[in-house]
């Protein structure tokens, strides 16, 4: 039975050219996290964190994506095209698969402040 919940940074905004942390956290379960996939709004994978193999950043994102903190992902040198949905998929044993969603809005405005808060989607 899947008892866990995914908490995410929810809806966040950040400045063009800046960076942002995409974070998901699995709670309320003792299940072992075997793999976390990070996926972009067009369903292309950005990165995978496998418990045994470690991190793999997809070549197309190597210059702009840094692993961590933790199982999260840091997106750098943001462009307007980075606006959209991001998904974390937690593969766990024995529970199965959990999914979290984050919406990132990249703002042109130089006064835009990075806003983030943990919330349950």
């Amino acid at each position: 039975m899947m008892t866990g919940t995914i908490e995410t940074t929810g809806n966040i905004s950040a400045k063009k050219g800046g960076s942002v942390i995409l974070q998901c956290h699995l709670s309320s379960t003792m299940a072992q996290v075997t793999q976390v996939n990070w996926e972009q709004h067009d369903h292309s994978l950005l990165a995978i964190r496998n418990a045994e193999l470690g991190w793999h950043i997809y070549p197309a994102f190597k210059d702009r994506v840094a692993p961590g903190p933790g199982l999260g992902l840091t997106l750098q040198s943001l462009t307007m095209n980075d606006t959209g949905e991001y998904f974390c998929t937690y593969h766990t044993y024995p529970d199965g698969t959990y999914r979290g969603r984050i919406f990132l809005e990249v703002l042109e405005s130089s006064v835009a402040e990075h806003s983030a808060r943990f919330q349950i989607p």
């Epitope: 793999q35 996939n37 996926e39 067009d42 369903h43 994978l45 496998n50 193999l53």
Partner: antibody
Framework: QVQLQESGPGLVKPSQTLSLTCTVT?????????WNWIRQFPGKKLEWMGY???????TYNPSLKSRITISRDTSKNQFSLKLSSVTAADTATYYC????????????WGQGTLLTVSS | DIVMTQSPSSMSTSVGDRVTITCRAS??????VAWYQQKPGKSPKLLIY???FRYTGVPDRFSGSGSGTDFTFTISSVQAEDFATYYC?????????FGAGTKLELK
């Protein structure tokens, strides 16, 4: 129980357009999946042709890009394949299959339909 | 395109034997490889994804391993119902590509 069922003509003439439909039951085609066409040639080689996602976005195999169109009818929970200018080399068993965008594997397949291109 | 080279193309074995099939990707696919079983006249069935994750309901005699470019699929003790054709598939990037298949036959 998720089920996919292909339908279409078993025979198409060379240079014509092949049309197949996949009817999905037990899963909405507007939920978090991509809906695929895969074909298997007589020699058993499998070729992924393309998909349409729950949001209607399509991705095609570049080897077919100029000839392929995948569309959907959400009211009937169906998606369709059109392949133009067919030749004998397009003779194959055509499968529709569900791909988990977040799980990234084909978990459900149709039973397949054999399509022969011949005059 | 990523080419998946599978070997052997066929093999003869007996019930109870241990069987290993290999698949080599033409470029690094991390662990993004799935394995499918297909019986004559049927559609492929998912067994393994992400190289080593057993799909729901798949018996534990089926296992997978590997990363980067080299992957292995193993049946620890072949049962009568396992005689079929097995395919590897990379799910690293589109176009998604399959190996040519390995036909497992009764010796």
């Amino acid at each position: 129980q998720v089920q996919l069922q292909e339908s279409g003509p078993g025979l198409v003439k060379p240079s014509q357009t092949l049309s197949l439909t996949c009817t999905v039951t037990g899963s909405s085609i507007t939920s978090d999946y991509a809906w695929n066409w895969i074909r298997q040639f007589p020699g058993k080689k499998l070729e992924w042709m393309g998909y349409i996602t729950y949001s209607g976005r399509t991705t095609y195999n570049p080897s077919l890009k100029s000839r392929i169109t995948i569309s959907r009818d959400t009211s009937k929970n169906q998606f369709s394949l059109k392949l133009s200018s067919v030749t004998a080399a397009d003779t194959a068993t055509y499968y529709c299959a569900r791909w988990g965008l977040l799980r990234r594997y084909f978990d459900y397949w149709g039973q397949g339909t054999l399509l022969t291109v011949s005059s | 395109d990523i080419v998946m080279t599978q070997s052997p193309s066929s093999m003869s074995t007996s019930v109870g034997d241990r069987v290993t099939i290999t698949c080599r990707a033409s470029q690094d696919v991390f662990n993004q490889v799935a394995w499918y079983q297909q019986k004559p006249g049927k559609s492929p069935k998912l067994l393994i994804y992400s190289a080593s994750f057993r799909y729901t309901g798949v018996p534990d005699r089926f296992s997978g391993s590997g990363s980067g470019t080299d992957f292995t699929f193993t049946i620890s003790s072949v049962q009568a119902e396992d005689f079929a054709t097995y395919y590897c598939q990379q799910h690293y990037s589109t176009p998604l590509t399959f190996g040519a298949g390995t036909k497992l036959e009764l010796k």
